[in-house]
């Protein structure tokens, strides 16, 4: 036990970060939201399009209340890390035709890396389960052809809409339990 | 401003007992994992164990698994650490630390002799 | 011995630009977990200086700054200053042990 420390250093408290957190993630849902109209627009969508690859809706709003912190944020976590590793995927083997979604879709992959640092200290000053950040996982197949690719783009946007949208309901729910 | 004041350490026999607490103020508590770290004197840090916000997730660093306890009463603001089977090695200032760890207190320290 | 290894002793002149490093495996670092860096002044309790690989609290100077890559971090002191001769630590999770592992710490001398 030594002398009295020197002047406070502070970080965000879990709730002040829980805030930001939701800031970002809207932030990010409308960057999304944006982003695949600008996509309708130049490659109007015939139909749904899914992708195999992709997590499944982690669940309805609805079921929200029954939702606990740790399973929430680690489902987010796992979901988001996906779809970050899914627009990684789009901008490198989409073909020439998504090259006109850039810079846009650059700007998405660096939010959703922010937003995937911030979950991740705001699980590590909750002190909850933190499963790594970074799996490993199976490369993903490049698309069969420049429609393919479109069609990809389609379904990962509209996936990580609705992703996002379930986030931030869950993470406005969650700041009442904290 | 931030406060963490650990409490409870002491000289203690080979195989006897003591229970750390750690008294928190200036913040959130409640919102905040706690960890407990200790330091050997004259060596680097050693993390010894940490509870989740509500108390509802322990993980223990093997060297104290079986031997020591982590709790919290949140409605107290406190954080504890009840430390049995005590030994020479586990001679050391302990710290209370909360979140990252963010804030650490000064420390208490902890001496197993005989 | 620390799962986090890091140089035991570094030094350097005041004004002068130190690095330290600090290296970590496949369950830590490598994993993609944050690092975050402690300076323990003598006779004193760690104190946070930089989380998540290169965020400041507010409070430190931004002569420290953090950065990682793969399975290494390090930590940068610029415009070195006698009251930085300290202790600093590097942290990290550690998926296998569920826990936060430390460096063993590196002592850092202003000549």
């Known amino acids: 036990p030594g002398p009295p420390p020197g002047p406070p250093r502070v970080s965000p408290d879990p709730r002040a970060e829980l805030d930001s957190t939701v800031l970002l993630t809207r932030s990010l849902l409308a960057d999304t939201r944006q982003l695949a109209a600008q996509l309708r627009d130049k490659f109007p969508a015939d139909g749904d399009h899914n992708l195999d690859s992709l997590p499944t809706l982690a669940m309805s709003a609805g079921a929200l209340g029954a939702l606990q912190l740790p399973g929430v944020l680690t489902r987010l976590r796992a979901d988001l890390l996906s779809y970050l590793r899914h627009v990684q995927w789009l901008r490198r083997a989409g073909g020439s035709s998504l090259k006109t979604l850039e810079p846009e879709l650059g700007t998405l992959q660096a939010r959703l890396d922010r937003l995937l640092r911030r979950l991740q200290l705001l699980m590590s000053r909750l002190a909850l389960p933190q499963p790594p950040p970074d799996p490993p996982a199976p490369p993903l197949a490049p698309p069969s052809s420049a429609w393919g690719g479109i069609r990809a783009a389609h379904a990962i946007l509209g996936g990580l809409h609705l992703t996002l949208d379930w986030a931030v309901r869950g993470l406005l729910l969650l700041k009442t339990r904290l | 401003e931030v406060q963490l004041l650990e409490s409870g350490g002491g000289l203690v026999q080979p195989g006897g007992s003591l229970r750390l607490s750690c008294a928190a103020s200036g913040f959130t508590f409640s919102s905040y994992g706690m960890h407990w770290v200790r330091q050997a004197p004259g060596k680097g840090l050693e993390w010894v164990s940490v509870i989740s916000y509500d108390g509802s997730y322990k993980y223990y660093a093997d060297s104290v698994k079986g031997r020591f306890t982590i709790s919290r009463d949140n409605s107290k603001n406190t954080l504890y650490l009840q430390m049995n089977s005590l030994r020479a090695e586990d001679t050391a200032v302990y710290y209370c630390?909360?979140?990252?760890?963010?804030?650490w207190g000064q420390g208490t320290l902890v001496t197993v002799s005989s | 011995q620390s799962v986090l290894t890091q140089p035991p002793s570094a030094s350097g002149t005041p004004g002068q630009r130190v690095t330290i490093s600090c290296t970590g495996s496949?369950?830590?670092?490598?994993?993609?977990?944050?690092v975050h860096w402690y300076q323990q002044l003598p006779g004193t309790a760690p104190k946070l200086l930089i989380y998540s690989n290169n965020e400041r609290p507010s409070g430190v100077p931004d002569r420290f700054s953090g950065s990682k890559s793969g399975t290494s971090a390090s930590l940068a002191i610029s415009g070195l200053r006698s009251e930085d001769e300290a202790d600093y630590y590097c942290?990290?999770?550690?998926?296998?042990?569920?826990?936060?592992?430390f460096g063993g710490g590196t002592k850092l001398t202003v000549l």
């Open positions: 942290a990290a999770w550690d998926i296998s042990l569920n826990g936060p592992v």
């Open positions: 496949s369950s830590n670092i490598g994993a993609g977990y944050d």
């Open positions: 630390a909360a979140g990252v760890p963010d804030y």
